[in-house]
């Protein structure tokens, strides 16, 4: 009786041992598979995130292109209308120029001394920008950014004068504190006779030969033949 119980116990032990080994193996397999699934999920997640990011970037890029296309189309159709009409008035701005109120503006991306910048504008039937109001100051400031940029204000001939003849004394001014100072301390000969936007939008006088960026302005209603 006792030996029979011993045999049954041994058999149960073997069965249990086999079951444990089998379970351990299954757990290991499942654990491995789980790890693989987790890794695959992570991989898929990062792929999905990347695809979403790429899509988002593509969408933004596409939107920018569409905006630019619409802007160019509007500009071209406007100029076509001018050409088809009698051409006496410019109601739109040339391509790459930005319209604001009654003027068109062109913002350079390179630098030139003040006289060369003004000459460049004149060749475009324009002049260096004349800042006439709070609103125009803010508009230009936004487009120029925190960069030194020439404006159409100079005292090379004595008093400060705007290049288009706008009265300086009664007009808008946005000089930085202590400016203009006609500083001679730079040691480059002479004082400072040309005005420019500084990084914060305030105006400063500087040597006219500095190669700063510049802003051209032309009237929208100006005769297209001139």
């Amino acid at each position: 009786q006792n030996s029979k119980l011993q045999e049954e116990l041994q058999a149960l032990r073997e069965t249990f041992s086999n079951l444990t080994a089998s379970t351990d193996a299954k757990v290991k397999t499942l654990s491995m598979q789980g790890g693989n699934v987790g890794r695959k999920m992570k991989s898929l997640e990062s792929q999905l995130e990347k695809q979403q990011q790429d899509l988002s970037e593509d969408h933004s890029s596409l939107l920018l292109h569409v905006k630019q296309f619409v802007s160019d189309l509007r500009s071209l159709s406007c100029q076509m209308a001018v050409l088809q009409g009698n051409g006496s008035e410019r109601t739109c701005c040339p391509v790459n120029w930005v319209g604001y109120e009654g003027s068109c503006y062109w913002f350079s991306r390179s630098g030139k001394p003040w006289p060369e910048a003004e000459k460049y504008c004149q060749l475009e039937n324009a002049h260096l920008v004349v800042v006439g109001s709070w609103e125009e100051q803010k508009f230009i400031q936004h487009h120029v950014g925190p960069v030194n940029s020439w404006i159409g204000l100079t005292d090379q001939s004595g008093p400060w004068k705007w290049v288009d003849g706008t009265d300086y004394e009664s007009g808008f001014k946005n000089w930085r504190p202590e400016q203009p100072d006609d500083w001679y301390g730079h040691g480059l000969g002479g004082g400072e006779d040309c005005a420019h936007f500084t990084e914060d939008g305030g105006w400063n006088d500087d040597i006219c030969q500095r190669p700063y960026r510049w802003v051209c302005e032309t009237q929208r209603d100006r005769d297209s033949g001139s």
Partner: antibody, heavy 118, light 107 residues
């Protein structure tokens, strides 16, 4: 520390005049534009006027144009608001504030109360 | 004149809540928008300039966004000291104009 202190408020009859002052300390007054802003009892903020650091530009709210004058004395670090032809609707707490880049107001005084009443 | 419209005019929220205040300009003001906070009996406090730049010393839970005509002030996790009135202000054009204010109250 940077400080603005308004004074000159009080009770005044309609049609009369009053001059508010704002004493600045703790910063280079002559390097900053300055504003006046007002707040009627229980109401929101209303911008009144701005003057450039050097006095070269002055702008006013339509509601005070021709009646109020903003001025400054950089040697005494003081901002002024001359108010004339006062009306009941000018009743408010008047604040002076330092300008940050054409329009922002980064430092404010504690305010002075103006009451226009007969 | 440029009109500034804030919404809502008032809201109730709890400490820890995320709060969003909208400000709309009647015309394009690019990004020339500031936000102020005012507590009862006190002068306004400058929070945010040019739509999204945080004024020095202002907690980072405050943030601003938007351009053109639509702007937002967000408080990511409302603190007890944030219960106040918030004003937007445009500086693109004179006369400078403020929104009517948004009162943030305790729920």
């Amino acid at each position: 520390q940077v400080q603005l202190v308004e004074s000159g408020g009080g009770v005044v009859q309609p049609g009369r005049s009053l001059r508010l002052s704002c004493a600045a300390s703790g910063f280079t007054f002559s390097s900053f534009g300055m504003h006046w802003v007002r707040q009627a009892p229980g109401k929101g903020l209303e911008w009144v006027a701005i003057i450039w650091h050097d006095g070269s530009n002055k702008y006013y709210a339509d509601s005070v144009k021709g009646r109020f004058t903003i001025s400054r004395d950089n040697s005494n670090n003081t901002l002024y608001l001359q108010m004339s032809s006062l009306r009941a609707e000018d009743t408010a707490v008047y604040y002076c504030a330092r300008d940050l880049s054409m329009g922002g107001m980064d430092v404010w005084g504690q305010g002075t109360t103006v009451t226009v009443s007969s | 004149d440029i009109q500034m419209t804030q919404s809502p005019s008032s809201l109730s929220a709890s400490v820890g809540d995320r709060v969003t205040i909208a400000c709309r300009a009647s015309q394009n003001i690019i990004s020339y928008l500031n936000w102020y906070q005012q507590k009862p009996g006190k002068a306004p406090k400058f929070l945010i300039y040019t739509a999204s730049s945080l004024q020095s010393g202002v907690p980072s839970r405050f943030s601003g966004s938007g351009s053109g005509t639509d702007f937002t002030l967000t408080i990511s996790s409302l603190q007890p000291e944030d219960f106040a009135i918030y004003y937007c202000q445009q500086t693109y054009s004179t006369p400078l104009t403020f929104g009517g204010g948004t009162k943030v109250e305790i729920k």
